[in-house]
């Protein structure tokens, strides 16, 4: 699997990972680059309560990932949230997900060496029209 | 912001830890989990009462090196007649995700890892309303 | 010193095909991302296509698309851009561009490519 | 698809004069980053300020970048006659280019 400035070998007939344009493990700078200013999202904003396909954050929590916690949205309500603070069946709330890389420390405990893991979490939820199905 | 140590005291260093020099960590690039692929409802940024549009940022120097990112179309929210609603506001959702960035330091290469904000679609919220005195 | 050198522009016809060059000198070609852009005639900047340091990523601009074929040979300190069934509004100087990680900070002379029946 | 909108058009201005470019993204984007060029007739373009702020290599201290989010501002604290020319923001990632502010000698 190819990718930007990072190539991975597949099988054996891949050239050395030693050869500088195929860099299996790489060492990283330990201080991360943080160009954003988002911190937990249940402070950020609360957008999770005044959403018309309101949704709950679960604290997912890893001490062998970082980051070691992650918050995963679950939707409220299968309909969403009408005009009268009622629930509209009629519109579906929604999971919205994201593949987000994070780092899992490899092999087990140890303070300096990770692998890249790709996991999927639900960010939080969207009130859509549902696809309906007309039987024949 | 450095990476926190194992904190737990039950978690000794094993034997098997390699060795890393000070300030910086090993970091294998082989990606698990490389082939899940989200299944997510069929075209919801379109079907979303708060729809949004994606636009791919692509970078030579940073692993993944496409980026996906999701802009909300209106200020405002599609009613059931199909018209924009601007007294309920589109919003994005936002998710940190980590890359790696491979840069220069005078004639070596190295490798940053870097936090990156992703937009991944849009919920339609009520507004908040600020009552000047 | 740093020096980016293209080649093989010039006048086409609609449909046809063109390889442009660009011969890198001065630096570590294969440490570096590199780029290709065009400017029409009295106009603007438009970035056409981008290729990672190894091959290993590629980046296209939408109007170029499964057009354009950007390559690199790092043996040869040379980077490509196969152009096929070229349109008049591909008419453009065509410069080869070197990646700094945040900007294109050196760039070649140009190349002029005409698509003209 | 993001677009850059670069004002003034053209800027008129005297040699010794500060000049301040405008250029607005249409979206903002973590890990984008900002640029901008300089570009003289029949010249191939040359870098100025890359990453919103941090002047090229031998670039004059009078150039300098700023801004965040989606508005970026490139300042000529006092006009050289060699400054005269076309200049063009870029967002890098999106690899958009804005249209361009020529700055002309008054």
């Known amino acids: 699997i190819v990718k930007a400035g990072i190539t991975i070998p597949r099988n054996p007939g891949c050239p050395n990972s030693e050869d500088k344009n195929f860099p299996r493990t790489v060492m990283v700078n330990l201080n991360i680059h943080n160009r954003n200013t988002n911190t937990n999202p249940k402070r950020s904003s609360d957008y999770y309560n005044r959403s018309t396909s309101p949704w709950n954050l679960h604290r997912n929590e890893d001490p062998e990932r970082y980051p070691s916690v992650i918050w995963e949205a679950k939707c409220r309500h299968l309909g969403c949230i009408n005009a009268d603070g009622n629930v509209d069946y009629h519109m579906n709330s929604v999971p919205i997900q994201q593949e987000i890389l994070v780092l899992r420390r490899e092999p087990p405990h140890c303070p300096n060496s990770f692998r890249l893991e790709k996991i999927l979490v639900s960010v939080g939820c969207t009130c859509v029209t549902p696809i309906v199905h007309h039987v024949a | 912001r450095k990476i926190p140590k194992v904190g737990h005291t039950f978690f000794q260093k094993p034997e098997s830890c390699p060795p890393v020099p000070g300030g910086s960590m090993k970091l294998d690039i082989g990606i698990i989990n490389e082939n899940q692929r989200v299944s997510m409802s069929r075209n919801i940024e379109s079907r979303s009462t708060s729809p949004w549009n994606y636009t791919v940022t692509w970078d030579p120097n940073r692993y993944p090196s496409e980026v996906v990112q999701a802009q909300c179309r209106n200020l405002g929210c599609i009613n059931a007649q199909g018209k924009e609603d601007i007294s309920m506001n589109s919003v994005p959702i936002q998710q940190e995700t980590l890359v790696v960035r491979r840069k220069h330091q005078g004639c070596s290469v190295s490798f940053q890892l870097e936090k990156v904000l992703v937009t991944v679609g849009c919920t339609c919220v009520t507004p908040v309303i600020h009552h000047v005195q | 010193e740093v020096q980016l050198v293209e080649s093989g522009g010039g006048l086409v016809q609609p449909g046809r095909s063109l390889r442009l060059s660009c011969a890198a000198s001065?630096?570590?070609?294969?440490?570096?991302?590199m780029h290709w852009v065009r400017q029409a005639p009295g106009k603007g900047l438009e970035w056409v296509s981008g290729?990672?340091?190894?091959?290993?990523?590629?980046g296209y601009a939408d109007s170029v698309k499964g057009r354009f074929t950007i390559s690199r040979d790092n043996a040869k300190n040379s980077l490509y851009l196969q152009m096929n069934s070229l349109r008049a509004e591909d008419t453009a100087l065509y410069y080869c561009?070197?990646?700094?990680?945040?900007?294109?900070?050196?760039w070649g002379q140009g190349t002029t490519v005409t698509v003209s029946s | 698809e993001i677009v850059l909108t670069q004002s003034p058009g053209t800027l008129s201005l005297s040699p010794g004069e500060r000049a301040t470019l405008s250029c607005r993204a249409s979206?903002?984007?973590?890990?984008?980053?900002l640029a901008w060029y300089q570009q003289k007739p029949g010249q191939a373009p040359r870098l100025l300020i890359y990453?919103?702020?941090s002047r090229a290599t031998g670039i004059p201290d009078r150039f300098s970048g700023s801004g965040s989010g989606t508005d970026f501002t490139l300042t000529i604290s006092r006009l050289e006659p060699e400054d005269f020319a076309v200049y063009y923001c870029?967002?890098?990632?999106?690899?958009?280019f804005g249209q361009g502010t020529k700055v002309e000698i008054k």
């Open positions: 990453d919103t702020s």
């Open positions: 001065g630096f570590t070609f294969d440490d570096y991302a």
């Open positions: 870029q967002q890098y990632g999106t690899w958009t």
């Open positions: 561009a070197k990646d700094m990680v945040y900007a294109l900070d050196v």
């Open positions: 979206q903002s984007f973590s890990g984008s980053y």
């Open positions: 290729i990672s340091w190894n091959s290993g990523s590629r």
